[in-house]
């Protein structure tokens, strides 16, 4: 069989849900000496990137600025060792967001509800969508899907206190586009004194793992660049549509 | 945003050489990744070749390489693609495209990376 080098890990910088018209950053992470990275869009080559000097970093960052529908999709990315190219990474979904509309979030029976409650969220957007979205923040990648004509539901079914936080949905365009997203609705449950404080509460940055950990190289870094490499592909669990 | 506009095509007998030049308006000239692309008649615009911001990385589309050269003078607002042993197939509407990208060793392979055109030169080569 031909001999490939490991596959790298593709990321998106902050978040991989990009505001129309505003820059996204793709992180290649590769290998030490790679002399070229190439990211892919939709199966076709998009960009090309060559380091320099290429043995002093072990990844890319590629921009795509003017964010738009064009530019969203599947990404995935591969890169060269003298002329030996890694496997494809696996694949990232690219969403550009604030397209056309604003949805309206709502929660039933209300925002403050007690804990082992039915809760349902509603989204609704009285443009032509059937797609809507709903997302916790801190948990961007944990999408919820649900299809409606102008309103979607989403049943939460009995909620814990794991479900505090602040949700907002998006109507969807197709898998890739997406719309404005709704105003926050902050849900709290409450539950016995001791579950209450105990619960963790939610992060409102972006997902921590929505970072670029691209390195530059020291003598020890060469030896162990392999290993964590290959270290990291397997540990690094993917999101998909 | 800036403007592109194309010189330098006409029609030439196979095996000769052109020259195409793109003018670059405004002064953020070397900020920009720069493209040439074709379109024959009755087929989809495709990629020749490409050159970063200050000029470290170049690529070209394998039917070209070796044969057509890109290079830019970012003093001059100009990126040139130098065409040599021009064969028929070679005929086409040829486009400069730009683009703002932050690294200085990128470049946009995809129609979709490019978000400024110029309007083209027309290119014929005959036999």
């Known amino acids: 069989p031909k001999q490939t080098l490991p596959k790298p890990i593709i990321r998106a910088e902050s978040t991989y849900m990009v505001p129309k018209e505003k820059q996204a950053t793709l992180c290649c992470q590769g290998s030490y000496g790679a002399v070229e990275y190439q990211l892919h869009f939709e199966g076709s080559l998009f960009a090309v990137e060559r380091p320099k000097p290429p043995e002093r970093i072990n990844g890319v960052k590629f921009h795509i600025p003017d964010m738009n529908s064009r530019k969203a999709g599947r990404y995935s990315c591969i890169y060269r060792v003298g002329e030996l190219w890694s496997e494809r990474s696996d694949l990232l979904d690219l969403v550009v967001t604030e397209m056309y509309d604003t949805p309206t979030l709502s929660v039933h029976p209300g925002p403050e509800v007690t804990s082992g409650e039915k809760v349902t969220f509603y989204c609704r957007l009285d443009t032509a969508t059937s797609m809507f979205l709903l997302l916790k923040e801190g948990r961007s990648r944990d999408v919820q899907r649900s299809y409606g004509k102008v309103q979607a539901e989403f049943p939460m079914g009995p909620v814990t206190t794991a479900h505090r936080g602040s949700y907002r949905c998006f109507g969807s365009y197709n898998n890739y586009a997406w719309s404005f997203p709704s105003e926050p609705v902050k849900l709290l449950v409450t539950g016995d004194i001791e579950n209450t404080s105990l619960a963790p509460t939610d992060p409102t940055f972006p997902d921590s793992w929505d970072t670029c950990l691209l390195t530059r190289e020291t003598g020890l870094q060469k030896d162990l660049a392999l290993w964590d490499h290959t270290a990291q592909n397997h540990h690094h669990h993917h999101h998909h549509h | 945003q800036v403007q592109l506009v194309e010189s330098g095509g006409g029609l030439v007998q196979a095996g000769d050489s052109l020259r195409l030049s793109c003018v670059a308006s405004?002064?953020?000239?070397?900020?920009?990744?720069m493209g040439w692309f074709r379109q024959a008649p009755g087929k989809e615009r495709e990629f020749v070749a490409a050159i970063s911001r200050n000029a470290d990385t170049t690529y070209y589309a394998d039917s070209v390489k070796g044969r057509f050269t890109i290079s830019r003078d970012n003093a001059k607002n100009t990126v040139y693609l130098q065409m040599n042993s021009l064969k028929p197939e070679d005929t086409a509407v040829y486009y400069c495209?730009?683009?703002?990208?932050?690294?200085?060793?990128?470049?946009?392979?995809?129609?979709?990376?490019?978000?400024?055109w110029g309007q083209g030169t027309q290119v014929t080569v005959s036999s």
């Open positions: 495209a730009a683009d703002r990208y932050s690294s200085n060793t990128q470049v946009g392979v995809a129609r979709t990376y490019y978000d400024y």
């Open positions: 405004g002064r953020t000239f070397s900020t920009y990744a």
